[in-house]
Protein backbone atom coordinates (compact mmCIF):
# COMPACT_ATOMS: atom_id res chain seq x y z
CA UNK A 1 0.00 0.00 0.00
CA UNK A 2 1.43 3.36 -1.06
CA UNK A 3 1.19 6.23 1.41
CA UNK A 4 -1.10 9.13 0.52
CA UNK A 5 1.17 12.13 -0.11
CA UNK A 6 0.65 15.37 -2.03
CA UNK A 7 1.96 15.49 -5.58
CA UNK A 8 5.14 17.58 -5.83
CA UNK A 9 4.84 20.84 -7.74
CA UNK A 10 5.11 20.40 -11.52
CA UNK A 11 4.78 16.61 -11.42
CA UNK A 12 1.03 16.28 -11.99
CA UNK A 13 0.59 13.94 -14.98
CA UNK A 14 -1.16 15.58 -17.91
CA UNK A 15 -1.15 12.33 -19.89
CA UNK A 16 0.03 8.76 -19.58
CA UNK A 17 3.44 8.86 -21.22
CA UNK A 18 7.03 7.68 -20.88
CA UNK A 19 7.99 10.39 -18.41
CA UNK A 20 6.10 8.38 -15.77
CA UNK A 21 8.70 5.61 -15.75
CA UNK A 22 10.86 7.92 -13.61
CA UNK A 23 8.11 8.36 -11.02
CA UNK A 24 8.45 6.59 -7.71
CA UNK A 25 5.46 4.58 -6.55
CA UNK A 26 4.22 7.30 -4.20
CA UNK A 27 4.52 9.85 -7.00
CA UNK A 28 2.41 7.72 -9.32
CA UNK A 29 -0.17 7.38 -6.55
CA UNK A 30 -0.20 11.13 -5.90
CA UNK A 31 0.28 12.56 -9.38
CA UNK A 32 -1.63 10.30 -11.77
CA UNK A 33 -5.37 10.91 -11.90
CA UNK A 34 -7.27 7.61 -11.97
CA UNK A 35 -9.80 8.92 -14.51
CA UNK A 36 -6.95 9.97 -16.82
CA UNK A 37 -5.44 6.51 -16.44
CA UNK A 38 -8.78 4.87 -17.29
CA UNK A 39 -9.18 6.86 -20.50
CA UNK A 40 -5.57 6.22 -21.60
CA UNK A 41 -5.23 2.59 -20.57
CA UNK A 42 -4.27 1.67 -24.13
CA UNK A 43 -0.95 3.51 -23.62
CA UNK A 44 0.11 1.76 -20.42
CA UNK A 45 1.45 -1.45 -21.92
CA UNK A 46 3.64 0.36 -24.43
CA UNK A 47 5.47 2.07 -21.56
CA UNK A 48 8.17 0.08 -19.72
CA UNK A 49 6.75 0.39 -16.20
CA UNK A 50 8.17 -1.91 -13.54
CA UNK A 51 5.86 -4.52 -12.05
CA UNK A 52 5.75 -2.45 -8.84
CA UNK A 53 4.63 0.62 -10.75
CA UNK A 54 1.95 -1.41 -12.49
CA UNK A 55 0.70 -2.51 -9.07
CA UNK A 56 0.19 1.14 -8.18
CA UNK A 57 -1.73 1.77 -11.41
CA UNK A 58 -3.95 -1.24 -10.72
CA UNK A 59 -4.61 0.08 -7.22
CA UNK A 60 -5.72 3.40 -8.70
CA UNK A 61 -8.18 1.65 -11.01
CA UNK A 62 -9.49 -0.43 -8.10
CA UNK A 63 -10.21 2.74 -6.16
CA UNK A 64 -11.92 4.39 -9.12
CA UNK A 65 -14.06 1.33 -9.91
CA UNK A 66 -14.78 -0.53 -6.65
CA UNK A 67 -17.75 -2.31 -8.28
CA UNK A 68 -15.64 -3.59 -11.18
CA UNK A 69 -13.98 -2.08 -14.24
CA UNK A 70 -16.01 -0.98 -17.28
CA UNK A 71 -15.39 -2.88 -20.50
CA UNK A 72 -13.65 0.13 -22.08
CA UNK A 73 -10.90 -0.28 -19.47
CA UNK A 74 -10.91 -4.09 -19.42
CA UNK A 75 -10.24 -4.29 -23.16
CA UNK A 76 -6.98 -2.38 -22.76
CA UNK A 77 -5.65 -3.98 -19.57
CA UNK A 78 -2.96 -5.95 -21.36
CA UNK A 79 -0.33 -7.06 -18.86
CA UNK A 80 -2.41 -5.73 -15.95
CA UNK A 81 -4.87 -8.57 -16.61
CA UNK A 82 -2.24 -10.96 -15.25
CA UNK A 83 -2.29 -8.99 -12.00
CA UNK A 84 -6.05 -9.36 -11.53
CA UNK A 85 -7.42 -11.87 -9.06
CA UNK A 86 -10.45 -14.08 -9.81
CA UNK A 87 -12.29 -11.93 -7.25
CA UNK A 88 -11.53 -8.82 -9.33
CA UNK A 89 -12.74 -10.51 -12.50
CA UNK A 90 -16.00 -11.72 -10.93
CA UNK A 91 -17.02 -8.05 -10.70
CA UNK A 92 -16.68 -7.56 -14.45
CA UNK A 93 -19.34 -7.69 -17.12
CA UNK A 94 -17.54 -8.69 -20.32
CA UNK A 95 -19.83 -8.90 -23.34
CA UNK A 96 -17.56 -8.21 -26.31
CA UNK A 97 -15.73 -11.07 -28.00
CA UNK A 98 -13.00 -8.56 -28.90
CA UNK A 99 -12.40 -7.89 -25.21
CA UNK A 100 -12.23 -11.62 -24.50
CA UNK A 101 -9.72 -12.13 -27.33
CA UNK A 102 -7.59 -9.21 -26.13
CA UNK A 103 -7.27 -10.71 -22.66
CA UNK A 104 -6.72 -14.28 -23.88
CA UNK A 105 -3.86 -12.94 -26.04
CA UNK A 106 -2.13 -11.70 -22.88
CA UNK A 107 -2.18 -15.19 -21.39
CA UNK A 108 -1.30 -16.93 -24.66
CA UNK A 109 1.19 -19.76 -24.34
CA UNK A 110 0.45 -20.28 -20.65
CA UNK A 111 -1.81 -22.82 -18.99
CA UNK A 112 -5.36 -21.71 -18.36
CA UNK A 113 -4.98 -19.67 -15.16
CA UNK A 114 -7.70 -19.19 -12.53
CA UNK A 115 -8.04 -15.64 -13.89
CA UNK A 116 -8.70 -16.88 -17.42
CA UNK A 117 -11.10 -19.58 -16.21
CA UNK A 118 -13.07 -16.95 -14.28
CA UNK A 119 -13.07 -14.58 -17.25
CA UNK A 120 -14.39 -17.28 -19.60
CA UNK A 121 -17.01 -18.32 -17.08
CA UNK A 122 -18.21 -14.71 -16.72
CA UNK A 123 -18.27 -14.26 -20.49
CA UNK A 124 -20.15 -17.47 -21.28
CA UNK A 125 -22.69 -16.94 -18.49
CA UNK A 126 -23.27 -13.40 -19.77
CA UNK A 127 -23.98 -14.75 -23.25
CA UNK A 128 -26.24 -17.51 -21.96
CA UNK A 129 -24.71 -20.19 -24.17
CA UNK A 130 -21.49 -21.22 -25.89
CA UNK A 131 -22.13 -19.83 -29.37
CA UNK A 132 -19.95 -20.78 -32.33
CA UNK A 133 -17.81 -17.60 -32.37
CA UNK A 134 -17.04 -17.94 -28.66
CA UNK A 135 -16.21 -21.63 -28.99
CA UNK A 136 -14.05 -20.88 -32.02
CA UNK A 137 -12.11 -18.32 -30.01
CA UNK A 138 -11.76 -20.41 -26.87
CA UNK A 139 -10.62 -23.59 -28.60
CA UNK A 140 -8.13 -21.59 -30.67
CA UNK A 141 -6.45 -20.44 -27.46
CA UNK A 142 -7.11 -23.57 -25.38
CA UNK A 143 -7.64 -26.72 -27.44
CA UNK A 144 -8.60 -28.60 -24.26
CA UNK A 145 -11.25 -26.07 -23.29
CA UNK A 146 -14.28 -28.10 -24.34
CA UNK A 147 -13.16 -31.13 -22.35
CA UNK A 148 -12.69 -28.99 -19.25
CA UNK A 149 -16.45 -28.41 -19.10
CA UNK A 150 -18.81 -30.61 -17.13
CA UNK A 151 -21.52 -32.57 -18.99
CA UNK A 152 -24.02 -30.09 -17.53
CA UNK A 153 -22.10 -27.13 -18.96
CA UNK A 154 -21.72 -28.88 -22.30
CA UNK A 155 -25.47 -29.26 -22.53
CA UNK A 156 -25.69 -25.50 -23.17
CA UNK A 157 -23.61 -25.83 -26.34
CA UNK A 158 -25.93 -25.38 -29.33
CA UNK A 159 -25.48 -27.90 -32.18
CA UNK A 160 -24.51 -25.06 -34.52
CA UNK A 161 -21.38 -24.45 -32.40
CA UNK A 162 -20.14 -27.99 -33.06
CA UNK A 163 -18.88 -26.85 -36.45
CA UNK A 164 -16.14 -24.94 -34.63
CA UNK A 165 -14.80 -28.07 -32.92
CA UNK A 166 -11.58 -29.63 -34.23
CA UNK A 167 -10.55 -33.25 -33.53
CA UNK A 168 -7.76 -32.14 -31.16
CA UNK A 169 -10.29 -30.20 -29.09
CA UNK A 170 -11.80 -33.54 -28.02
CA UNK A 171 -8.56 -35.36 -27.17
CA UNK A 172 -9.04 -35.16 -23.40
CA UNK A 173 -12.83 -35.60 -23.30
CA UNK A 174 -14.12 -38.52 -21.28
CA UNK A 175 -17.10 -40.74 -22.31
CA UNK A 176 -19.58 -38.72 -20.22
CA UNK A 177 -18.66 -35.57 -22.12
CA UNK A 178 -18.82 -37.30 -25.50
CA UNK A 179 -22.25 -38.68 -24.56
CA UNK A 180 -23.44 -35.06 -24.44
CA UNK A 181 -21.55 -33.84 -27.50
CA UNK A 182 -22.29 -36.72 -29.88
CA UNK A 183 -26.04 -36.11 -30.32
CA UNK A 184 -25.29 -32.44 -30.97
CA UNK A 185 -22.69 -33.36 -33.59
CA UNK A 186 -25.10 -35.84 -35.21
CA UNK A 187 -27.67 -33.08 -35.49
CA UNK A 188 -25.15 -30.51 -36.73
CA UNK A 189 -23.79 -32.76 -39.51
CA UNK A 190 -27.03 -34.55 -40.46
CA UNK A 191 -27.27 -32.99 -43.93
CA UNK A 192 -23.81 -34.08 -45.06
CA UNK A 193 -23.24 -37.03 -47.37
CA UNK A 194 -21.79 -40.33 -46.15
CA UNK A 195 -18.02 -39.90 -46.42
CA UNK A 196 -18.02 -36.21 -45.45
CA UNK A 197 -20.33 -36.97 -42.54
CA UNK A 198 -17.97 -39.65 -41.24
CA UNK A 199 -14.95 -37.32 -41.38
CA UNK A 200 -16.82 -34.77 -39.25
CA UNK A 201 -18.52 -37.17 -36.81
CA UNK A 202 -15.47 -39.41 -36.28
CA UNK A 203 -14.04 -37.45 -33.33
CA UNK A 204 -17.38 -37.57 -31.50
CA UNK A 205 -18.04 -41.31 -31.91
CA UNK A 206 -16.98 -42.05 -28.34
CA UNK A 207 -20.54 -41.03 -27.49
CA UNK A 208 -22.29 -43.01 -30.24
CA UNK A 209 -24.89 -45.70 -29.39
CA UNK A 210 -24.94 -49.20 -30.95
CA UNK A 211 -27.61 -48.41 -33.55
CA UNK A 212 -25.54 -45.57 -34.99
CA UNK A 213 -22.47 -47.80 -35.21
CA UNK A 214 -24.57 -50.42 -37.02
CA UNK A 215 -25.73 -47.74 -39.46
CA UNK A 216 -22.15 -46.62 -40.08
CA UNK A 217 -21.10 -50.20 -40.79
CA UNK A 218 -23.38 -50.12 -43.84
CA UNK A 219 -21.59 -47.11 -45.32
CA UNK A 220 -18.05 -48.37 -46.08
CA UNK A 221 -16.47 -45.87 -43.71
CA UNK A 222 -13.23 -47.78 -42.93
CA UNK A 223 -12.95 -46.64 -39.31
CA UNK A 224 -9.38 -46.68 -38.01
CA UNK A 225 -8.46 -48.64 -34.88
CA UNK A 226 -7.70 -45.52 -32.86
CA UNK A 227 -11.31 -44.38 -33.31
CA UNK A 228 -12.67 -47.88 -32.66
CA UNK A 229 -10.74 -48.12 -29.38
CA UNK A 230 -12.43 -44.94 -28.15
CA UNK A 231 -15.95 -46.26 -28.71
CA UNK A 232 -18.16 -47.01 -25.73
CA UNK A 233 -17.78 -50.64 -24.70
CA UNK A 234 -21.53 -51.01 -24.19
CA UNK A 235 -22.09 -49.72 -27.75
CA UNK A 236 -19.56 -52.13 -29.29
CA UNK A 237 -20.60 -55.32 -27.49
CA UNK A 238 -23.85 -55.94 -29.45
CA UNK A 239 -22.12 -55.56 -32.85
CA UNK A 240 -21.77 -58.75 -34.87
CA UNK A 241 -18.47 -59.88 -36.37
CA UNK A 242 -19.80 -58.99 -39.83
CA UNK A 243 -20.73 -55.48 -38.66
CA UNK A 244 -17.31 -54.86 -37.11
CA UNK A 245 -15.66 -56.17 -40.26
CA UNK A 246 -17.68 -53.74 -42.39
CA UNK A 247 -17.13 -50.88 -39.93
CA UNK A 248 -13.33 -51.29 -39.94
CA UNK A 249 -12.88 -52.35 -43.56
CA UNK A 250 -9.15 -52.87 -44.25
CA UNK A 251 -8.34 -51.84 -40.66
CA UNK A 252 -9.96 -54.99 -39.27
CA UNK A 253 -6.53 -56.65 -39.13
CA UNK A 254 -5.64 -54.23 -36.33
CA UNK A 255 -8.00 -56.08 -33.97
CA UNK A 256 -5.31 -58.70 -33.36
CA UNK A 257 -2.93 -56.15 -31.85
CA UNK A 258 -5.68 -54.82 -29.59
CA UNK A 259 -7.24 -58.15 -28.54
CA UNK A 260 -6.25 -57.69 -24.87
CA UNK A 261 -7.58 -54.15 -24.61
CA UNK A 262 -11.06 -52.78 -24.16
CA UNK A 263 -13.42 -52.61 -25.97
CA UNK A 264 -11.92 -55.27 -28.31
CA UNK A 265 -11.28 -57.78 -25.50
CA UNK A 266 -14.85 -57.59 -24.19
CA UNK A 267 -16.30 -57.71 -27.69
CA UNK A 268 -14.27 -60.84 -28.59
CA UNK A 269 -15.57 -62.64 -25.50
CA UNK A 270 -19.15 -61.98 -26.63
CA UNK A 271 -18.69 -63.55 -30.10
CA UNK A 272 -19.03 -67.14 -31.27
CA UNK A 273 -15.66 -68.64 -32.12
CA UNK A 274 -16.90 -69.70 -35.55
CA UNK A 275 -17.74 -66.09 -36.38
CA UNK A 276 -14.36 -64.85 -35.14
CA UNK A 277 -12.60 -67.47 -37.26
CA UNK A 278 -14.12 -65.95 -40.42
CA UNK A 279 -11.84 -62.96 -39.87
CA UNK A 280 -8.76 -65.16 -40.17
CA UNK A 281 -6.94 -63.21 -37.47
CA UNK A 282 -6.54 -65.94 -34.88
CA UNK A 283 -8.79 -64.19 -32.35
CA UNK A 284 -9.75 -66.46 -29.44
CA UNK A 285 -13.12 -65.92 -27.73
Amino acid sequence: EVEKTACPSGKKAREIDESLIFYKKWELEACVDAALLATQMDRVNAIPFTYEQLDVLKHKLDELYPQGYPESVIQHLGYLFLKMSPEDIRKWNVTSLETLKALLEVNKGHEMSPQVATLIDRFVKGRGQLDKDTLDTLTAFYPGYLCSLSPEELSSVPPSSIWAVRPQDLDTCDPRQLDVLYPKARLAFQNMNGSEYFVKIQSFLGGAPTEDLKALSQQNVSMDLATFMKLRTDAVLPLTVAEVQKLLGPHVEGLKAEERHRPVRDWILRQRQDDLDTLGLGLQG
Epitope: N45, F49, Y51, G78, Y79, A102, E105, K108
Partner: nanobody, 126 residues
Framework: QVQLVESGGGVVQPGRSLRLSCAAS????????MHWFRQAPGKERELVAG????????YYADSVKGRFTISRDNSKNTLYLQMNSLRAEDTAVYYC???????????????????WGQGTLVTVSS
Amino acid sequence: QVQLVESGGGVVQPGRSLRLSCAASGSIFESDRMHWFRQAPGKERELVAGINIGTNTYYYADSVKGRFTISRDNSKNTLYLQMNSLRAEDTAVYYCAAFLWKSYGSSDGGYYLQYWGQGTLVTVSS
Protein backbone atom coordinates in the same frame (compact mmCIF):
# COMPACT_ATOMS: atom_id res chain seq x y z
CA GLN B 1 14.77 -16.05 -21.30
CA VAL B 2 17.44 -13.46 -20.46
CA GLN B 3 19.97 -13.53 -17.62
CA LEU B 4 21.74 -10.39 -16.47
CA VAL B 5 24.93 -10.13 -14.43
CA GLU B 6 26.19 -6.78 -13.15
CA SER B 7 29.78 -5.99 -12.21
CA GLY B 8 32.01 -2.99 -11.54
CA GLY B 9 30.64 -1.84 -8.19
CA GLY B 10 32.85 -0.88 -5.28
CA VAL B 11 33.87 1.87 -2.88
CA VAL B 12 34.84 5.19 -4.43
CA GLN B 13 35.53 8.71 -3.16
CA PRO B 14 33.18 11.61 -3.92
CA GLY B 15 34.00 13.29 -7.25
CA ARG B 16 35.55 10.13 -8.72
CA SER B 17 34.24 7.88 -11.49
CA LEU B 18 33.11 4.27 -11.83
CA ARG B 19 31.88 2.18 -14.73
CA LEU B 20 29.28 -0.55 -14.24
CA SER B 21 28.80 -3.40 -16.69
CA CYS B 22 25.83 -5.69 -17.28
CA ALA B 23 26.38 -8.84 -19.33
CA ALA B 24 23.19 -10.19 -20.93
CA SER B 25 22.79 -13.80 -22.02
CA GLY B 26 19.88 -14.29 -24.40
CA SER B 27 18.46 -12.22 -27.22
CA ILE B 28 17.80 -8.50 -26.98
CA PHE B 29 15.77 -7.12 -29.87
CA GLU B 30 14.94 -3.71 -31.34
CA SER B 31 11.62 -3.52 -29.55
CA ASP B 32 13.30 -3.90 -26.18
CA ARG B 33 14.63 -1.54 -23.50
CA MET B 34 17.66 -1.80 -21.24
CA HIS B 35 17.62 0.11 -17.94
CA TRP B 36 19.78 0.86 -14.93
CA PHE B 37 17.97 1.20 -11.61
CA ARG B 38 19.30 1.85 -8.14
CA GLN B 39 18.07 1.32 -4.62
CA ALA B 40 19.58 3.20 -1.70
CA PRO B 41 19.28 1.72 1.82
CA GLY B 42 15.72 2.18 3.11
CA LYS B 43 14.61 3.82 -0.14
CA GLU B 44 12.49 2.78 -3.09
CA ARG B 45 14.11 1.48 -6.24
CA GLU B 46 14.38 4.22 -8.89
CA LEU B 47 15.15 4.37 -12.57
CA VAL B 48 18.52 5.96 -13.29
CA ALA B 49 18.92 5.64 -17.06
CA GLY B 50 17.61 3.67 -20.00
CA ILE B 51 18.00 2.91 -23.70
CA ASN B 52 15.24 2.36 -26.22
CA ILE B 53 17.10 -0.03 -28.50
CA GLY B 54 14.77 0.36 -31.49
CA THR B 55 14.98 4.15 -31.66
CA ASN B 56 18.47 4.38 -30.11
CA THR B 57 17.26 7.01 -27.66
CA TYR B 58 18.66 7.49 -24.17
CA TYR B 59 16.90 8.83 -21.11
CA TYR B 60 18.09 9.83 -17.64
CA ALA B 61 16.71 10.71 -14.23
CA ASP B 62 17.11 14.41 -13.45
CA SER B 63 19.40 13.61 -10.54
CA VAL B 64 22.08 12.03 -12.78
CA LYS B 65 21.75 14.06 -16.01
CA GLY B 66 25.14 15.32 -17.18
CA ARG B 67 27.02 12.99 -14.82
CA PHE B 68 25.98 9.47 -15.88
CA THR B 69 26.07 7.98 -19.38
CA ILE B 70 24.38 4.76 -20.46
CA SER B 71 25.75 2.82 -23.44
CA ARG B 72 25.62 -0.58 -25.01
CA ASP B 73 28.06 -2.80 -26.87
CA ASN B 74 26.01 -4.87 -29.31
CA SER B 75 28.81 -7.28 -30.13
CA LYS B 76 29.33 -8.16 -26.47
CA ASN B 77 25.65 -7.93 -25.53
CA THR B 78 26.72 -5.73 -22.65
CA LEU B 79 25.17 -2.62 -21.09
CA TYR B 80 27.30 0.01 -19.35
CA LEU B 81 26.76 2.87 -16.94
CA GLN B 82 29.55 5.39 -16.80
CA MET B 83 29.23 7.35 -13.54
CA ASN B 84 31.24 10.56 -13.16
CA SER B 85 31.35 13.18 -10.39
CA LEU B 86 29.96 10.69 -7.91
CA ARG B 87 28.23 11.96 -4.77
CA ALA B 88 27.42 10.40 -1.41
CA GLU B 89 23.74 10.28 -2.44
CA ASP B 90 24.65 7.99 -5.36
CA THR B 91 25.40 5.22 -2.83
CA ALA B 92 23.05 2.35 -3.67
CA VAL B 93 22.74 -1.13 -5.12
CA TYR B 94 22.62 -0.71 -8.91
CA TYR B 95 20.49 -3.09 -10.94
CA CYS B 96 20.45 -3.82 -14.63
CA ALA B 97 17.02 -4.62 -16.10
CA ALA B 98 15.90 -5.83 -19.52
CA PHE B 99 12.38 -4.96 -20.59
CA LEU B 100 11.62 -7.35 -23.44
CA TRP B 101 8.63 -6.61 -25.64
CA LYS B 102 6.25 -9.56 -25.91
CA SER B 103 4.03 -9.04 -28.91
CA TYR B 104 0.60 -10.66 -29.12
CA GLY B 105 1.38 -11.62 -32.69
CA SER B 106 -2.11 -11.23 -34.11
CA SER B 107 -2.24 -7.51 -33.36
CA ASP B 108 0.13 -4.65 -32.62
CA GLY B 109 -0.50 -5.11 -28.91
CA GLY B 110 1.93 -6.45 -26.38
CA TYR B 111 3.63 -5.72 -23.09
CA TYR B 112 7.05 -5.77 -21.47
CA LEU B 113 8.42 -8.84 -19.73
CA GLN B 114 11.00 -7.85 -17.15
CA TYR B 115 14.29 -9.48 -16.26
CA TRP B 116 16.51 -8.23 -13.45
CA GLY B 117 20.10 -8.75 -12.41
CA GLN B 118 21.19 -9.40 -8.82
CA GLY B 119 22.68 -5.93 -8.40
CA THR B 120 26.12 -4.49 -7.64
CA LEU B 121 26.84 -2.23 -4.66
CA VAL B 122 28.29 1.25 -5.20
CA THR B 123 29.46 3.08 -2.08
CA VAL B 124 30.54 6.72 -2.40
CA SER B 125 32.45 7.69 0.72
CA SER B 126 35.51 9.66 1.71
